[in-house]
Interface confidence: medium
């Protein structure tokens, strides 16, 4: 399937609109600090060049790889060294090292201002004045803040973003129509970004085999009626798509994702009965719908797993002949029978099975050795079940905010060296597992909760990797992808931590807190809570609860005061004194 000109091939496959959007995303994800106008200029230059190649594939430079073309273009940016420092050194390298170098400099936490939402009328005017620029700016702002955002999915978000403005800017009450839609897109976007970040981390840190194992388990749960060969084909194609997107090959990724959606819809009879509605939708909606489709019903008469994987005398023979295929079949068979298990649990079971076979197939009596392998699964299954039960009970007792606070305290005591903003962000997201998953019946709780926690803990891992401060975090993040959550769960209070010096400035608050949204006010309070624990890591739950109650009363009191700033200054001193007394300082 070789083409004389790769850039012409992708331009023709994707069409000009998607081509330009994807190149903009790619550039913004690489050069996250560059102004919007600079990126638009680069994209226009690449697009004009692509058009010349479409007209004549033999034209000069049209035979170059996309990495070469895009890398050359990025390296023309005049301020590269001043803005990006050592990233400019990438430009001295040849492909493929140059692209690898750009990838390594992607920043999961770029120093960019928070996106402030303008007034609805201002947004609607901007949308009407120049729709194309308005939508490009959306792609640019999301892509530079989320350098691993799944590019074809970002096109889907942009389509919904456009639809929201098209509808709501004509509505009688623009704000009532638009704001909930924008909130939904923002929340879904953050979730989508985090999920994709885990896929990329899986591929980049643990390799293709780890990603394929994850995909086998998840697709087998989703398509339990599909044959193993069918699931294997989908896994291979899906791995290619995500490898490309995570590697910055966004044009190839989007093209291959469209091909995969087409294949799935053409073969839905042998894949899943749940795909019909998805397959009637336009391309971007179709791909999104397939990715989110509910699990198909399990075939009625699936035989016991033990026959093929424990009782059979051919277990070691089959394993030796093709280890990964045999383990893949085990994972497929187990996963299609267990939509009630998290993917990470299924992968732990498969790893236990693999370890047992490695040991037993070299033993004098292999069958005797692996006969009880399924008994080893019981504690692995019960551990997340018990953890979820306990935490859902705690969530139901406390509500989301106080549950987040309990997790903040728990995680700050485990890894107090981690920066306060990271602990707040991660613990808030961990706490959202309650409202997201505890409402589900037992059969759906574990896949919802544990796979969500994997996504959130990956955020901690990628943020920590940028500036490593805790050996314990590094250990949990790097030793095993599937055991990250149990590793963090098992961490106790870090006894080696030297408490932070008390700094009154950290606990000084001003009247601006009164005008913050409820969410922002919570974050302020939770930031103070983390600092409190870092300052007094041995504080009891009751002590911390007491101080936080005092803090809430203080904010409530001063926000009702006539002279708020004076109240915050005077009452703040009393609060600090009372808090120090409460904590025995």
């Amino acid at each position: 399937d070789a083409h004389k000109s790769e850039v012409a091939h992708r331009f023709k496959d994707l069409g000009e609109e998607n081509f330009k959007a994807l190149v903009l995303i790619a550039f913004a994800q690489y050069l996250q600090q560059c102004p919007f106008e600079d990126h638009v200029k680069l994209v226009n230059e690449v697009t004009e060049f692509a058009k010349t190649c479409v007209a004549d594939e033999s034209a000069e430079n049209c035979d170059k790889s996309l990495h070469t073309l895009f890398g050359d273009k990025l390296c023309t940016v005049a301020t590269l060294r001043e803005t990006y420092g050592e990233m400019a050194d990438c430009c001295a390298k040849q492909e493929p090292e140059r692209n690898e170098c750009f990838l390594q400099h992607k920043d999961d936490n770029p120093n960019l201002p928070r996106l402030v939402r303008p007034e609805v009328d201002v947004m609607c005017t901007a949308f009407h004045d120049n729709e194309e620029t308005f939508l490009k700016k959306y792609l640019y702002e999301i892509a530079r803040r989320h350098p691993y955002f799944y590019a074809p999915e970002l096109l889907f978000f942009a389509k919904r973003y456009k639809a929201a403005f098209t509808e709501c800017c004509q509505a009688a009450d623009k704000a009532a129509c638009l704001l909930p839609k924008l909130d939904e897109l923002r929340d879904e976007g953050k979730a989508s970004s985090a999920k994709q970040r885990l896929k990329c981390a899986s591929l980049q840190k643990f390799g293709e085999r780890a990603f394929k194992a994850w995909a086998v388990a998840r697709l087998s749960q989703r398509f339990p009626k599909a044959e193993f060969a069918e699931v294997s084909k989908l896994v291979t194609d899906l791995t290619k798509v995500h490898t490309e997107c995570c590697h910055g090959d966004l044009l190839e990724c989007a093209d291959d994702r469209a091909d995969l959606a087409k294949y799935i819809c053409e073969n839905q009879d042998s894949i899943s009965s749940k795909l019909k509605e998805c397959c009637e939708k336009p391309l971007l909606e179709k791909s999104h719908c397939i990715a989110e489709v509910e699990n198909d019903e399990m075939p009625a008469d699936l035989p016991s797993l033990a026959a093929d994987f424990v009782e059979s005398k051919d277990v070691c023979k089959n394993y030796a002949e093709a280890k990964d295929v045999f383990l893949g079949m085990f994972l497929y068979e187990y996963a299609r029978r267990h939509p009630d298990y998290s993917v990470v649990l299924l992968l732990r079971l498969a790893k236990t099975y693999e370890t047992t076979l490695e040991k037993c197939c070299a033993a004098a009596d292999p069958h005797e050795c692996y006969a009880k392998v399924f008994d080893e699964f019981k504690p692995l299954v019960e551990e997340p079940q018990n953890l979820i039960k306990q935490n859902c009970e705690l969530f139901e007792q406390l509500g989301e905010y106080k549950f987040q606070n309990a997790l903040l305290v728990r995680y700050t005591k485990k890894v107090p060296q981690v920066s306060t903003p990271t602990l707040v962000e991660v613990s808030r997201n961990l706490g959202k597992v309650g409202s997201k998953c505890c409402k589900h019946p037992e059969a759906k709780r574990m896949p919802c909760a544990e796979d969500y926690l994997s996504v959130v803990l990956n955020q901690l891992c990628v943020l920590h990797e940028k500036t490593p401060v805790s050996d314990r975090v590094t250990k949990c993040c790097t030793e095993s992808l599937v055991n990250r959550r149990p590793c963090f769960s098992a961490l106790e209070v870090d006894e080696t931590y030297v408490p932070k010096e008390f700094n009154a400035e950290t606990f000084t608050f001003h009247a601006d807190i009164c005008t913050l949204s409820e969410k922002e006010r919570q974050i302020k309070k939770q930031t103070a809570l983390v600092e409190l624990v870092k300052h007094k890591p041995k504080a009891t739950k009751e002590q911390l609860k007491a101080v936080m109650d005092d803090f809430a009363a203080f904010v409530e009191k001063c926000c009702k005061a006539d002279d708020k700033e004076t109240c915050f200054a005077e009452e703040g001193k009393k609060l600090v004194a009372a808090s120090q007394a409460a904590l025995g300082l």
Epitope: D549, A553, K557, K560, K574, A581, A582
Partner: nanobody
Framework: DVQLVESGGGLAQAGGSLRLSCAAS????????MGWFRQAPGKEREFVAT???????SYATSVQGRFTVSRDIAKNTVYLEMNNLKPEDTAVYSC?????????????????WGQGTQVTVSS
């Protein structure tokens, strides 16, 4: 000076309810926190619940969801509604009044105390 008088204690079955009252006289408490504490035989006095001048309410974890503190400013009275009582709730319950909005969960945060009322929960 300030006088605090508790009432409403007595004997209750496990799972039952009681309502304690704390009437204050001497001067008003619009700028202070009023709280309930309890002391079981051989144990230290422990925090139960408080209501502050702002109306902000706090509970000890052990009673959260079972006990409700409220006040009637006109009557200068604070109440403690106790539901789903357990044998471990058996203690002398005292009412306190403090002059600061902070530290309402520590005995040292209170300047005035009532004489207490006995609550006994049988299983």
């Amino acid at each position: 000076d300030v006088q605090l008088v508790e009432s409403g204690g007595g004997l209750a079955q496990a799972g039952g309810s009681l309502r304690l009252s704390c009437a204050a006289s001497g001067r008003t408490f619009s700028n202070e926190c009023m709280g309930w504490f309890r002391q079981a035989p051989g144990k230290e006095r422990e925090f139960v619940a408080t209501i502050r001048s702002t109306g902000h309410i706090s509970y000890a974890t052990s009673v959260q969801g079972r006990f409700t503190v409220s006040r009637d400013i006109a009557k200068n009275t604070v109440y403690l509604e106790m539901n789903n009582l357990k044998p471990e709730d058996t203690a002398v319950y005292s009412c306190g009044a403090g002059v600061s909005d902070y530290g309402c969960y520590r005995t040292s945060g209170y300047n005035y105390w009532g004489q207490g009322t006995q609550v006994t929960v049988s299983s």
